[in-house]
């Protein structure tokens, strides 16, 4: 019957295992008349055999080593062996099985790596080869280190990618390798096939020694350099020194100094430019980079510390002009009046900063003179003879002497006598009621007013009035600013109320001078007083927990895999249901309720990456608001995609006859990432037969010449295909065709006689 | 060795029928196609078409369908080609000819000729 | 069908002389699948049937002097008899096999003088 194994004749693939005898009959092809009789051509090898009445099959095991697809056509032939249907193609894929053990390239490998070189950047490769399928487990090498020798308190220094069979450095092997303690090593290195996942895979080992190299590349120590420098600058301060001569050094400025006043000569000096002054900057942190002549940094930049070291080129300054102190007229002896702070911008807690205070004058002198004593390194101001009669002298006038080591500067004092606190401020209500308010009122918004008096003295800070929440108002949501003239109170919203955590707050208000009650009189409850503020409730949309979700996957990950999540809550607790905007590619799907996001269709990093879409979150039931966040979905690059022509190489051609053999260069491309080395194409004729008359030869990773391999070609288009391999993991493989016309030629052009043919070439090689 | 052996002269009456043979010696009679062609005097060679002995399968040239009939006996080797309705204009030389190709021989021309009927047409 | 023609119809040259003959065809008879041209020569001397001489346009059969060459393609094609003997005296014909009905062209009469 018509089916798996019999039918009409058309393009058909075939694969069959390698390694296996025949054991049945690939197809039979069916003739429609007046075909009586088939015909097998292209790369048979002299395996595959098509019998008269058009039974396909082969004559002995297969294998995909020597070639991996075989690539036959099939014509219907008539009695004459004319033609008369196809030739079609058919492909037989020759799968892989594991016949073939990985082989090390070399059986010992040396190298050689720095001492603190950078954890994980490879200094040797070892590569072995496998015949088989890389595409399968049967071809996937498995890189490891069987043993370090010597091994050191059981610390492995070296680490090899047992992908890429690329040995780098541990974290320990970068810190603690030293040539003075050890300097070789030698590591056993075994690679299996099967990923090294089965019992049954195969193996090798090769032998590496290891040259551990002294790295003077080191961050030197931090340099001292004292400000306000005299000498002839520039002045070398440091160096650094790469391992080998011919580095290009440069400073990086990680913090974009308007002023760097640092420079690096070829030979690794350090040097200051300038004079530092420590008051506008203190400590100086930048980067010394070695390079090659390429400009590619050579290892990780060394950190420069230099620290500027103070000298005492700063006096003492006053806080202010005039400072204005208060002082009760009953207060005590040594009841502390006030402090003054001078400043010094000499560096902190050194002799340059540390200020003295002495009071020089007193005016009037009145009762007496040396009625206030100041503490020569507080600056605390105190009462020291006596109380002060206000009637008598309402105020004193102090010039204070502060000085640091060097530097001499006068402060001015005045002291006001002012009446006793002996009144407490008392409020004008004890209860302001109840407040309503909805949660979104805004910020900054006056909600209460509130009063309270005091019969001390006016305007002096016996009487001047603060008002605290000292109840109700954990979060800081509420603040009270005061009218200094006035004394009212003016309750303001400082954060956004929320009805979902505190939807009553009972308020307490209490009101203080600043000025200390006199002995023996305290605050009591008339210098408190309540509210209730009452909130209500806004409905209000989801919130996401962050404006942007980003997820990170691979192109190839199968359909149904959860590629990210993300999530948003109600504030008045509503359920939640999740959706997507702006999936233009149809990629990804939303579970409604967890928010979890899921690839519905195959990824295609080469169709742009990060894909971005929006999520949305609704409540359910309610007013169904919603909030809108960004889901980035960046995607890793696979090789999915293979080798192609760079552009249309239609229109080449050579003039016939050719006087010597001619050869063009042609560039290959492909759409996946290529990280740092860019391509590494390799070339070769896309079928035996092409190989009397052509020959490819590789220029670089992406070019290649196509050469003429004798003189005696007709005149007609020739298409040679060629085979470009991307070598990746899994390697993917591109044939394509290059049309190339032998002609006759006027000047150097292709001559056709007029209305001859169309799409006359027009590149001549 | 390989031979056609084709009757040497036919002469026939306008409107009569003749039928001439082609026998073929030295390979099997199934293996290849034979073809018929005309030679008028002076004049160029015509393809009538072929016959394919293995299981019949025959290709006549349009021009001369309805003139021609061709056939073959394999028992005893021989092709042969009917003429009808026959008239001056059909007087010439008629050759057979084995064609080249056959399963795995690939020989595209004609590699074995009779030596020709002679047909004349008169009353 | 595919009409071929010949010239010139006849020629008359010596003996060690270089011939060519043109052959003609109204429609390309390269075969895309596999780049051959589908045409062959024969020679009919006087009196016998015809015999080949090169099929596939350029290939001699064997046996064959190499003294005759095919060559061209697509239309265009050409018989060369590079040093005339005095038995090549003959008709020489071009016949295509690219399409059903097979047409032969009208000949060449090689004449020796």
């Known amino acids: 019957q018509e089916g798996k194994f019999s039918g009409p004749l058309k393009p058909m693939t075939f694969s069959i295992y390698e390694g296996q005898e025949p054991s049945q009959i690939i197809f039979q092809f069916k003739a429609n008349p007046p075909a009586v009789t088939f015909e097998l051509t292209g790369e048979t090898d002299n395996i595959f055999v098509i019998e008269r009445e058009g039974l396909l099959y082969y004559n002995r095991a297969l294998d995909r080593e020597t070639r991996s697809t075989h690539n036959l056509q099939v014509a219907a032939l008539d009695a004459n062996g004319i033609i008369v249907e196809g030739p079609v193609p058919i492909t037989i894929k020759v799968k892989d099985i594991n016949d073939n053990r990985p082989t090390f390239l070399q059986s010992k490998y040396e190298g050689s790596v720095r001492q603190n070189s950078r954890p994980g950047k490879p200094f040797l490769y070892v590569n072995a080869t496998d015949l088989d399928d890389p595409a399968t487990p049967n071809g996937q090498l498995y890189y490891q280190i069987v043993i370090q020798l010597p091994m050191i308190n059981n610390v492995m220094y070296f680490q090899i990618n047992n992908k890429t069979g690329a040995i780098s450095l541990t974290r320990e092997g970068s810190q603690e390798l030293n040539p003075a303690k050890n300097p070789s090593y030698n590591l056993v290195i075994s690679v299996k096939d099967m990923g090294g996942q089965s019992e049954n895979s195969f193996s090798d080992t090769t032998s590496v020694d290891i040259i551990v190299t002294e790295n003077i590349w080191k961050a030197p120590k931090p340099v001292e350099m004292v400000e306000n420098s005299t000498d002839p600058h520039p002045i070398k301060i440091t160096q650094v020194r790469w391992n080998d001569p011919g580095a290009q050094y440069s400073l990086v400025d990680k913090e974009k100094l308007p002023r760097f006043p640092f420079s690096i000569d070829q030979e690794g000096d350090i040097y200051v430019t300038q004079p530092l002054d420590r008051e506008e900057k203190d400590a100086y942190v930048f980067y010394a980079v070695a390079k090659d002549e390429y400009g590619k940094p050579l290892s990780y930049p060394l950190e420069i510390h230099v620290k500027v070291k103070d000298i005492n080129d700063n006096p003492p300054t006053c806080p202010s002009p005039v400072t204005v102190f208060e002082v009760q007229e009953n207060e005590r002896l040594g009841n502390s009046i006030g402090t003054l702070t001078a400043h010094d911008r000499d560096e902190e807690n050194t002799a340059n900063s540390f200020l003295n205070y002495r009071i020089v004058e007193q005016t009037p002198k009145l009762p007496m003179d040396g009625l206030f004593l100041i503490q020569t390194y507080a600056g605390m101001l105190q009462l020291a003879k006596q109380s002060l009669k206000k009637q008598d002298t309402p105020q004193y006038n102090l010039t204070i002497e502060v000085s640091d080591k060097d530097f001499k500067t006068l402060c001015f004092v005045q002291i006001n006598v002012i009446d006793i606190n002996d009144q407490i401020p008392i409020f004008e209500k004890s209860d302001y009621g109840n407040l309503t308010l909805a949660e979104d009122t805004n910020i900054g918004s006056t909600i209460l007013t509130i009063q309270a008096t005091d019969a001390d003295e006016p305007f002096t800070g016996s009487s001047k009035i603060l008002y605290h929440i000292i109840k109700g108002d954990s979060e800081g949501r509420l603040g009270v600013d005061t009218d200094p003239h006035t004394n009212t109170g003016y309750v303001i919203i400082k954060k956004p109320l929320d009805f979902e955590t505190a939807a009553v707050s009972n308020i307490v208000f209490k009101a203080e001078n600043p000025e200390p009650l006199v002995f023996g009189v305290k605050y009591n409850a008339s210098s408190f007083a309540k509210f209730t503020l009452i909130v209500t409730d806004v409905n209000e949309a989801p919130q996401f927990s962050q404006h942007v979700f980003q997820a990170k996957v691979s192109e190839d990950v199968a359909i149904g895999t959860k590629v990210g999540n993300v999530t948003a809550k109600d504030p008045e607790g509503l359920d939640i249901s999740y959706s997507l905007r702006g999936d233009t590619r149809g990629w990804l799907k939303i579970d409604h309720v967890t928010g979890e996001i899921f690839s519905v269709a195959p990824l295609d990093r080469e169709a742009g990456s990060p894909y971005r879409v929006q999520v949305v979150a609704t409540e359910v039931g309610g007013s169904s608001l919603s909030s809108v966040s960004e889901f980035h979905l960046i995607l890793m690059d696979v090789n999915d995609n293979p080798p192609r022509l760079a552009k249309d190489y239609t229109g080449l051609f050579f003039c016939h006859p050719l006087s010597a053999p001619g050869s063009l260069i042609f560039e290959a491309t492909d759409d996946d990432q290529h990280l740092f080395r860019g391509p590494h194409f390799t070339f070769s004729l896309g079928s035996g037969s092409l190989q009397n008359d052509w020959e490819v030869s590789k220029i670089n990773g992406t070019h290649a010449r196509l050469s003429t391999r004798h003189t005696e070609f007709e005149e007609r288009e020739y298409v040679v295909l060629i085979r470009i391999n991307d070598g990746g993991r899994p390697p993917l493989e591109g044939i394509v065709s290059l049309p190339v016309t032998f002609c006759s030629c006027v000047e150097g052009s292709c001559f056709r006689p007029a209305g001859h043919q169309t799409g006359i070439p027009t590149v001549g090689m | 060795e390989v031979q056609l052996q084709q009757s040497v002269a036919e002469l026939v009456k306008p409107g009569a029928s003749v039928k001439m043979s082609c026998k073929v010696s030295g390979y099997t009679l199934t293996d290849h196609t034979i073809h018929w062609m005309k030679q008028r005097p002076e004049q160029g060679l015509e393809w009538i078409g072929y016959?394919?002995?293995?299981?019949?399968?025959?290709g006549y040239n349009e021009k001369f369908k309805g003139k021609a009939t061709l056939t073959a006996d394999t028992s005893s080797s021989t092709a042969y080609m009917q003429l009808n309705s026959l008239t001056s204009e059909d007087s010439a030389v008629y050759f057979c000819?084995?064609?080249?190709?056959?399963?795995?021989?690939?020989?595209?021309?004609?590699?074995?000729w009779g030596q020709g009927t002679t047909l004349t047409v008169s009353s | 069908d595919i009409v071929m023609s010949q010239s010139p119809s006849s020629l008359a040259v010596s003996v060690g002389e270089k011939v060519t003959m043109s052959c003609k065809s109204s429609q390309s008879l390269l075969h895309s699948s596999n780049q051959k041209n589908y045409l062959a020569w024969y020679q009919q001397k006087p009196g016998q049937s015809p015999k080949v001489l090169i099929y596939w346009a350029s290939t001699r059969e064997s046996g064959v002097p190499d003294r005759f060459t095919g060559s061209g393609s697509g239309t265009d094609f050409t018989l060369t008899i590079t040093s005339v003997k005095s038995e090549d005296l003959a008709v020489y014909y071009c016949?295509?096999?690219?399409?059903?009905?097979?047409?032969f062209g009208g000949g060449t009469r090689l004449e020796i003088k």
């Open positions: 016949q295509q096999y690219y399409s059903y009905p097979w047409t």
């Open positions: 016959i394919y002995p293995r299981d019949g399968i025959t």
């Open positions: 000819a084995r064609w080249g190709y056959s399963y795995r021989n690939y020989a595209y021309y004609y590699d074995y």
